[in-house]
């Protein structure tokens, strides 16, 4: 922590300007009034402060606003945002997309994924839901940031907004997030024709249940292997060899390369070897011919 000293009269600060870059840390601490700093935050980013000096300024703001900064200050943080921790950001209430844009631009090129995720979370909370304008801002200024939101926050996305989401925005989404987004996407695209529907729904399919995947296999969609590999393991395991063949079309040839990877490996183990052989790829590990499969979990459930 910075030592408390009194400010020499000749160093007294009446406005935030470039002369402050020559102040030592303890001089900044003693001479800069926190309220003045807050009022003139829009000037800070234009001044080439060192990281050490920024630490002092942050300390000032923390003392002035122990419950979290007001949005008027947050909007003008500029490079001071790089000094914020997720704990700091969690105290904020942000509703303006201009604030979000400004801080996303500052964070670009810096390892700030935790801070950005927390910031986006605060924006969603502040605005009440993940509306179209917020989604548009995220896709434009922070591709992939949508997936930094928790499933709980994503549940506030109205289906009407799903159309604004691009495939690359979902690249880093996990299964739990896709579980939330998939039903919304299904609803959003329900009136589209077969091929158009598949193009739109494809990025969300990591959240699809088995019955929907089975339904797709009847529609000549020719699902690419990358999409198939992102399907939920639980959605893939009940599929028959015939269903996978119809689902993938010519892409089924790629199963050989993925033979040792989940969910293909797990799926292979549940198929009859005879059926796997019909794929013409030499896939191994299926249930040998003549073996009977007993599902003991069913018996346990009954006892």
């Amino acid at each position: 922590d910075v030592e408390r000293t009194t400010c020499p009269p000749e160093k007294e600060v009446h406005e935030i300007d470039e002369s402050l870059i020559f102040y030592k840390k303890r001089e900044l601490e003693a001479c800069v009034d926190a309220a003045l700093l807050a009022a003139q935050m829009d000037r800070v980013d234009a001044i080439p402060f060192t990281y050490e000096q920024l630490d002092v300024l942050k300390h000032k703001l923390d003392e002035l606003y122990p419950q979290g900064y007001p949005e008027s200050v947050i909007r003008h943080l500029g490079h001071l945002f790089l000094k914020m921790s997720p704990e700091d950001i969690r105290k904020w209430n942000v509703t303006s997309l201009e604030t979000l844009k400004a801080l996303l631009k500052v964070s670009k090129g810096h390892e700030m994924s935790a801070q950005v995720a927390t910031l986006i979370d605060r924006v969603v909370v502040g605005r009440g839901q993940l509306d179209k304008d917020t989604v548009d801002t995220l896709t434009a200024f922070c591709p992939g940031c949508l997936c930094s939101l928790s499933p709980e926050r994503l549940s506030s996305v109205p289906p009407s907004v799903i159309g604004a989401v691009r495939p690359q925005d979902l690249d880093t989404c996990g299964p739990r997030q896709l579980d939330v987004l998939y039903p919304k996407a299904r609803l959003a695209f329900q009136n589209m024709s077969g091929s158009e529907y598949f193009v739109k729904i494809r990025p969300f399919l990591g959240g699809a249940p088995t019955e929907d995947v089975k339904a797709l296999s009847q529609q000549n969609v020719s699902m690419d292997l990358a999409t198939f590999m992102k399907l939920r393991r639980e959605a893939v395991l009940p599929l028959t060899v015939a269903e996978v063949q119809k689902l993938l079309g010519p892409h089924v040839e790629g199963l050989k390369v993925e033979e040792q990877h989940s969910p293909v490996r797990d799926w292979i183990l549940k198929q009859r070897q005879d059926d796997l052989d019909t794929l013409g790829l030499g896939l191994q590990g299926g249930i040998p011919n003549g073996y009977l499969i007993l599902d003991l979990s069913v018996r346990e459930a009954l006892s």
Epitope: E253, G254, G280, L281
Partner: antibody, heavy 121, light 107 residues
Framework: EVQLVQSGAEVKKPGASVKVSCKAS????????MHWVRQAPGQGLEWMGN????????YYNERFRSRVTMTVDKSTSTAYMELSSLRSEDTAVYYC??????????????WGQGTTVTVSS | DIQMTQSPSSLSASVGDRVTITCKAS??????IAWYQHKPGKAPKLLIH???ELQPGVPSRFSGSGSGRDYTFTISSLQPEDIATYYC?????????FGGGTKVEIK
């Protein structure tokens, strides 16, 4: 040693059909799909389609879909490619090729020697 | 379908010259590209797969590089036996496509 041996050269009249064979040996025939590629004089290589040798399911290049038929005879480890309604532009060398599934959908590491088909009236 | 645009369509170089051929895919092919040498009356010969992996027995003067949509094939020092047509093949999609070919001649 993996070998793909194709049938001999053919001369056909426009409108006729031609059936080229490709006999595989040195590997398990039903473990690799068979592909067909052609090269017309002065033109580049063109992928025509492929066939699953285990269930006989083919996938064709859209350009040939209406005229090509790919089949297999598992008992003799032979793949066939039949092209109908021949025209002079179908004059080409036709190759069968086997993929190696090292990455993605596989690249071709073994090729037949090629079958020259000449379409002339 | 993925289109492969290969250039130049032909080139003439002296023995010992460095020769470069490029292939541009219509979309990202994730390095799934192979290069073939094709001589008249013979079957195409695989030289390189997965952008830069040299096939066993292929001379080290042949090399490949690239990523995304742009790929390059290089012969570091052209030899008389390298006279042939060279093709790229994308196998990122099951419906394979070849480049148009580059005919390499000796000056």
């Amino acid at each position: 040693e993996v070998q793909l041996v194709q049938s001999g050269a053919e001369v056909k009249k426009p409108g006729a059909s031609v059936k080229v064979s490709c006999k595989a040996s040195g590997y398990t025939f039903t473990n690799y799909w068979m592909h067909w590629v052609r090269q017309a004089p002065g033109q580049g290589l063109e992928w025509m389609g492929n066939i699953n040798p285990s269930n006989g399911g083919p996938y064709y290049n859209e350009r040939f879909r209406s005229r090509v038929t790919m089949t297999v005879d598992k008992s003799t480890s032979t793949a066939y490619m039949e092209l109908s309604s021949l025209r002079s532009e179908d004059t080409a060398v036709y190759y069968c090729a086997r993929p190696y599934y090292g990455s993605s959908y596989g690249y071709f590491d073994y090729w037949g020697q090629g079958t020259t088909v000449t379409v002339s009236s | 379908d993925i289109q492969m645009t290969q250039s130049p369509s032909s080139l003439s170089a002296s023995v010992g010259d460095r020769v470069t051929i490029t292939c541009k895919a219509s979309q990202d092919i994730n390095k799934y590209i192979a290069w073939y040498q094709h001589k008249p009356g013979k079957a195409p010969k695989l030289l390189i797969h997965y952008t830069s992996e040299l096939q066993p027995g292929v001379p080290s003067r042949f090399s490949g590089s690239g990523s995304g949509r742009d790929y390059t094939f290089t012969i570091s020092s052209l030899q008389p036996e390298d006279i042939a047509t060279y093709y790229c093949l994308q196998y990122a999609n099951p419906l394979r496509t070849f480049g148009g070919g580059t005919k390499v001649e000796i000056k």
